[in-house]
């Protein structure tokens, strides 16, 4: 689709005569009829196959024709066509005299013709005007012409339709040949595909507008090259999406089991040394003068009962001091001025003379101790219970009450839920803080791997997007054969399309 444009510039008819030679009265009021048709070697009358157009009266005898595109497009004259421009044409221009106001052919006498010119030839589509001048015996016509394409038509023959757009269906302008020229940031046949942010990962990223980088599920970051750990992951990272690779000091499926309680919680007080002794368990080695599971209790120097023979102990800044009962002396009241005659043995202890009665020794009944049997036996003073166990005096013996997760006479044994091998069929047992978990081999399931399941790895439909699943019988694993447009071990990632 295009337009043949004819620009009339000047018509000369100095004598004001018709083609017959007869003069016009009072002068030749001149208008033009134009006929555009297919190429003919000899231009002959007949249908104007490419179109016709007429002008109003433009002047009398000789006149110049002004450019006038405002008044209905009078000059240049427009001859639109809605077909492919063939590149050749024939043009007939007739100048007529209008005696009255009616310019219709049937209203004019046949001899009202002033002049007639006919040309033919090749004409390429273009913006440039071709200037021509045709002279007859009495008249001269100067004009120019060209063929241009209609809006949205392009190419050598105006046959390529192209309408610039910037919407969901494309983002482009049209080149002179009708090819699309994508707007900045767009690509593809119809410029529908945005050009993502430079460096945006080809598989993991996509974009819906230029210079954007949106990540597919499981990926993050400006360029979608960083993975996202598993939803349940606590203290871990990943190298592929949904993994949970534990940070140092953490263990378990979701890295939620504390293997370095000492560092993470610093439970030991008063400068004690902390030793990790398993998942969430630890042992504090106290500095002198401190006791308790976390060395949180300060020991008095009198707590070790250093005063013998019933001496009473007094704490002092630089240590302690023993106040001895009558008949005793020395730093710890260890020396006696008594003999068996003084009945020095308490709580039913029996007295034995020594060194010819110069001193004595007491033999104590059960549950009593001390050089005079003055002390009740406390079997817990040595703090024999490990792992925070509580020591209880039970008459002549003692017992340890253990914290959950520990057992043994002295709570020295860590209770492992896995010790009794609860996972069937070769399942791997994991000790958890309050229970256990079995990781089952292929072909088994259930809390204890007790349920035999099909070892067809494809039974769980692991492949996405209608991919075909194949079982590798040698390894009980699956392989996904992806349909066109998807990648990944499970065909989970679409390719190319956002």
């Amino acid at each position: 689709s295009g337009v043949f444009q004819l620009q009339l510039q000047e018509f000369i008819n100095e004598r004001g005569v018709l083609a017959s030679g007869r003069p016009c009265e009072p002068g030749c009021r001149t208008f033009f009829r134009v006929c555009l048709k297919h190429f003919q070697a000899v231009v002959s009358p007949g249908p104007c196959t490419f179109g016709t157009v007429s002008t109003p009266v433009l002047g009398t005898n000789s006149f110049a024709v002004r450019d006038d595109s405002s008044g209905g497009g009078r000059n240049p004259l427009q001859l639109p066509f809605n077909f492919t421009w063939p590149g050749t044409f024939s043009l007939i221009i007739e100048a007529w005299h209008a005696p009255g106001d009616d310019l219709r052919p049937e209203a004019l006498p046949p001899d009202a013709l002033i002049s007639k010119i006919a040309i033919q030839g090749s004409l390429a589509v273009g913006q440039n005007w071709l200037l021509d001048e045709q002279t007859s015996t009495l008249t001269r016509l100067r004009y120019s012409y060209r063929v241009i394409c209609s809006d949205n038509y392009y190419g050598d023959n105006c046959s390529r339709l192209c309408k610039k757009r910037n919407d969901h269906f494309g983002h482009y302008v049209c080149q002179p040949d009708g090819n699309l020229s994508c707007l900045p940031g767009w690509t593809g046949e119809y410029c529908q595909q945005p050009i993502c942010l430079s460096g945006c990962h080809e598989q993991n990223g996509y974009c819906s507008k230029p210079a954007e980088c949106l990540c597919r599920p499981g990926w993050q970051g400006r360029l979608c090259n960083e993975c996202i750990p598993h939803n349940g992951c606590r203290h871990g990272t990943c190298s592929t999406p949904w993994q949970c690779t534990c940070d140092e000091g953490w263990g378990g499926l979701f890295c939620d089991q504390d293997l370095n309680y000492c560092t993470h919680h610093s439970p030991c007080k008063n400068g004690a040394t902390c030793s990790n002794s398993g998942q969430r368990s630890y042992t504090c080695t106290c500095r002198p003068g401190y006791t308790g599971v976390d060395c949180e209790l300060e020991l008095s120097e009198c707590d070790s009962n250093p005063c013998r023979n019933g001496g009473s102990c007094k704490d002092q800044e630089d240590g302690y001091h023993c106040l001895c009962p009558p008949g005793y002396y020395g730093l710890h009241c260890e020396h006696s001025t008594l003999s068996c005659a003084d009945s020095p043995c308490f709580n039913g202890g029996s007295c034995r003379e020594r060194n010819q009665g110069a001193n004595y020794a007491c033999e104590c009944p059960p549950n009593f101790t001390g050089s005079n049997c003055e002390k009740k036996v406390d079997r817990c003073t040595s703090n024999p219970c490990a792992n925070g166990g509580q020591c209880l005096n039970r008459g002549p013996s003692r017992m340890c009450r253990c914290r959950p997760g520990f057992t043994g006479t002295y709570c020295e044994l860590h209770v492992s839920d896995c010790a009794r091998n609860p996972c069937a069929h070769g399942g791997t047992c994991h000790d958890l803080e309050n229970g256990l978990m079995c990781t089952c081999p292929a072909g088994f399931s259930g809390r204890r791997c007790e349920v035999r399941t099909s070892i067809d790895a494809c039974a769980s439909s692991p492949c996405f997007n209608r991919a075909t699943c194949y079982t590798d019988l040698s390894t009980d694993t699956f392989v996904c054969n992806c349909p066109y447009g998807f990648v990944g071990s499970r065909c989970e990632f679409p390719v190319g399309l956002p």
């Epitope: 993050q220 970051g221 400006r222 940070d247």
Partner: antibody, heavy 118, light 107 residues
């Protein structure tokens, strides 16, 4: 135990600024992307913004771009949401959550009610 | 953006019975769908992710199914603590979008 503890209720006037926070514990905060999700009174849930763990890249829903700022301080295990000029339409319960725009929101804070009224 | 449509808006079921909630996506989201439970005055809680994976500490009576554009949350035997609002959410396409919610109430 994973915990996301958010700052308290806020009542503000239009045009005022505001910064709410979300303190994380029980997981390695710097390893995970975080998000804000809001719920306008009597309405459903609406994703607002996301920040990556790796490089701090931020994303916002179109309707709030230029009005909110999401940020994080990994040294204090804290996520923030900031307004420079509040509008009445910002009135909502704002939840912080662990997750990105392309992953589930696995853990949620208790919510911060923001009321903007003249 | 992808529009998520949940149905029904309200579901009345008796305790002990089975409840089935539906969620439809306006375009294919593969299996990238999550379900959340929200009780009055509380934050949402993740129940299911990747269409059918149970989140931590979620009872086995909850299950999810579907793919592409049609998804279902099933609660096999309703307990009193299950009466709440349930939301589905897609995270396949940016931006992530939630359904408008289904209120599960005691019949």
């Amino acid at each position: 135990e994973v915990q996301l503890v958010q700052s308290g209720t806020e009542v503000k006037k239009p045009g005022e600024s505001l910064k709410i926070s979300c303190k994380a514990s029980g997981f390695t905060f710097s390893n995970f992307p975080m998000a804000w999700v809001r719920q306008m009174p009597g309405k459903g849930l609406e994703w607002v913004a996301t920040i990556s763990s790796s490089d701090g890249t931020t994303y916002y829903r179109d309707s709030v771009k230029g009005q909110f700022t999401i940020s994080r301080d990994n040294s204090f295990n804290t996520l923030f949401l900031q307004w420079s000029s509040l509008k009445a339409s910002d009135t909502a319960m704002y939840y912080c959550a662990r997750g990105y725009y392309n992953s589930p929101f696995a853990y949620w804070g208790q919510g911060t009610m923001v009321t903007v009224s003249s | 953006e992808i529009v998520m449509t949940q149905s029904p808006a309200t579901l009345s079921v008796s305790p002990g019975e089975r409840a089935t909630l539906s969620c439809r996506a306006s375009e294919d989201i593969y299996s990238n769908l999550a379900w959340y439970q929200q009780k009055p005055g509380q934050a949402p809680r993740l129940l299911i992710y990747d269409t059918n994976n149970l989140a931590d500490d979620v009872p086995a009576r909850f299950s999810g199914s579907g793919s592409g554009t049609e998804f279902t949350l099933t609660i096999s035997s309703l307990q009193s603590e299950d009466f709440a609002v349930y939301y589905c959410q897609q995270y396949n396409n940016y931006p992530p979008t939630f359904g408008q919610g289904t209120r599960l109430e005691i019949k």
